[in-house]
């Protein structure tokens, strides 16, 4: 979907010595590392599923597509890709795959291309808050990230190390300010229970986010009204109830927005009555006429749009005088 | 300081197999790499193969590629390393070690075991 693409109908392959072999002279600008495949007319180079433990030392200087799929990486240290000369042209960089556990700080420093990053599918149990911006810094200097794929990077359940996950890739996104013209984010498929609430006031050009496949029950702290250039905003597959009346305001004052709500457990009660109202007023859900009740039982799989307000209705509450036992 | 111990280990014939097992004495969280070393007689402890605790990502050493393969079971806090095809060179020592680097360094590992003896001969 997101990674670099390549336009390379021919590669050279490079001698099968050890991928970890560290060359202490600049490469020599038609070499290609160990266990790589590079197109200089297409400035690519795939180091795919080769099980590398080592991000190569010796990469080409032209490279401007970089894939490094499928290895055994499991830590990013800083400056993992800086070489002398700097890899200038470094403009898309794909890791998915490739087992990372740890990504320090400053792991992407020296790249000053990079516009593409791709980290997803793998298991970023210590993703350190200063991965993008490089330094501790209150502001950074911009990042000239332009897209981010964190997909599936959560670890399972155990190895999460008793602290917030959301949490831990959020202080990443903010550090320094240094996303500020990111304009695509992934997110998709994390587990994450809740969006904290700093993360989209601070991230302005976003054009599209996808937070699918989540767990997300509600959106009540989550502000949008920064996000005038949000084009895209992926919500399905989560655990959301309903949206309430601020959330919607702000979303039909984005002018630009598409927003996707399927597979959510909508739940038709009498909360439900102004969002079934504004759905059938709005253009900006994708798909719409695809929503259904998932609660209550007598409501299940009925059409949002097809609602009316009779049919949302909220069992009353007893006092506790009136409770029968 | 997490406590190590090694079993597994014997005398096997060349192109036998082996299984050897490390349990640890509790979930060494700060100790993101498990790895085997081994020491054969008069020669220095040489890196066999790492894994991470998360991750699961592996390495090896050139000579053990194909024939040996590490693994470890997080909920049994348990390090294995199977060893098939087994050579006279690969007699020795064979020491389970935690540490923090995904090296294949002695010095990159801050706990070890005491060893367990592999003896591969006719």
């Known amino acids: 979907s997101s990674s670099p693409t390549s336009s390379a109908s021919s590669f050279s392959s490079s001698a099968p010595f050890l991928a970890s072999a560290v060359s202490a002279q600049p490469p020599l600008p038609d070499q290609c590392p160990a266990l790589c495949e590079c197109s200089e007319a297409a400035r690519t180079v795939k180091c795919v599923n080769r099980n590398l433990t080592e991000v190569p030392t010796d990469l080409p200087a032209y490279v401007r597509n970089l894939f490094l799929t499928g290895n055994q990486l499991a830590v990013l240290p800083a400056g993992a890709f800086a070489r002398r000369p700097p890899l200038a042209e470094l403009a898309a960089l794909n890791l998915s795959g490739s087992r990372l556990d740890e990504v320090r700080a400053g792991a992407f420093e020296h790249l000053p291309s990079l516009r593409q990053l791709d980290l997803s599918h793998n298991p970023l149990a210590d993703l350190s808050p200063f991965a993008f911006s490089g330094s501790n810094a209150s502001v950074s200097a911009p990042s000239p990230l332009v897209e981010l794929i964190l997909n599936h990077i959560v670890p399972p359940e155990d190895e999460r190390q008793n602290r917030s996950f959301e949490g831990m890739v959020v202080a990443a996104l903010l550090a320094g300010r240094a996303l500020q013209g990111l304009r695509r984010l992934e997110l998709a498929s994390n587990h994450f229970l809740y969006l904290p609430r700093d993360v989209l006031a601070q991230l302005p050009s976003l054009r599209h986010l996808d937070l699918s496949n989540n767990s997300l029950v509600s959106l009540t702290y989550v502000s949008f009204r920064n996000l005038t250039h949000l084009e895209s905003l992926h919500l399905e597959d989560n655990a959301l109830k309903v949206l309430h009346n601020g959330t919607l305001a702000e979303l039909q004052g984005l002018p630009h927005i598409r927003v996707f709500l399927d597979n959510n457990p909508w739940v038709c009660d009498c909360h439900m009555a102004d969002m079934v109202t504004w759905l059938k007023e709005t253009e900006v859900v994708q798909g719409k006429d695809r929503l259904t009740c998932a609660y209550p039982e007598k409501m299940r799989n009925r059409v949002l749009l097809e609602l009316n307000s009779a049919d949302l209705d909220c069992d009353p509450i007893l006092p506790p005088s009136l409770q029968t036992s | 300081e997490v406590q190590l111990v090694e079993s597994g280990g014997g005398e096997v014939q060349p192109g036998g197999s082996l299984r050897l097992s490390c349990a640890a004495s509790r979930r060494p969280f700060s100790s993101k790499t498990m790895a085997w070393f081994r020491q054969a007689p008069g020669k220095e402890r040489e890196f066999v193969a790492a894994v991470r605790w998360i991750g699961g990502a592996t390495r090896y050493t050139e000579s053990v590629k194909g024939r040996f393969t590490i693994s470890r079971d997080n909920a049994k806090n348990t390090l294995y390393l199977q060893m098939s095809s087994l050579r006279a060179e690969d007699t020795a020592v064979y020491y389970c070690?935690?540490?923090?680097?995904?090296?294949?360094?002695?010095?990159?590992?801050?706990?070890w075991g005491q060893g367990t003896l592999v003896t591969v001969k006719p």
């Open positions: 070690a935690a540490g923090q680097a995904w090296g294949t360094k002695f010095t990159d590992y801050s706990d």
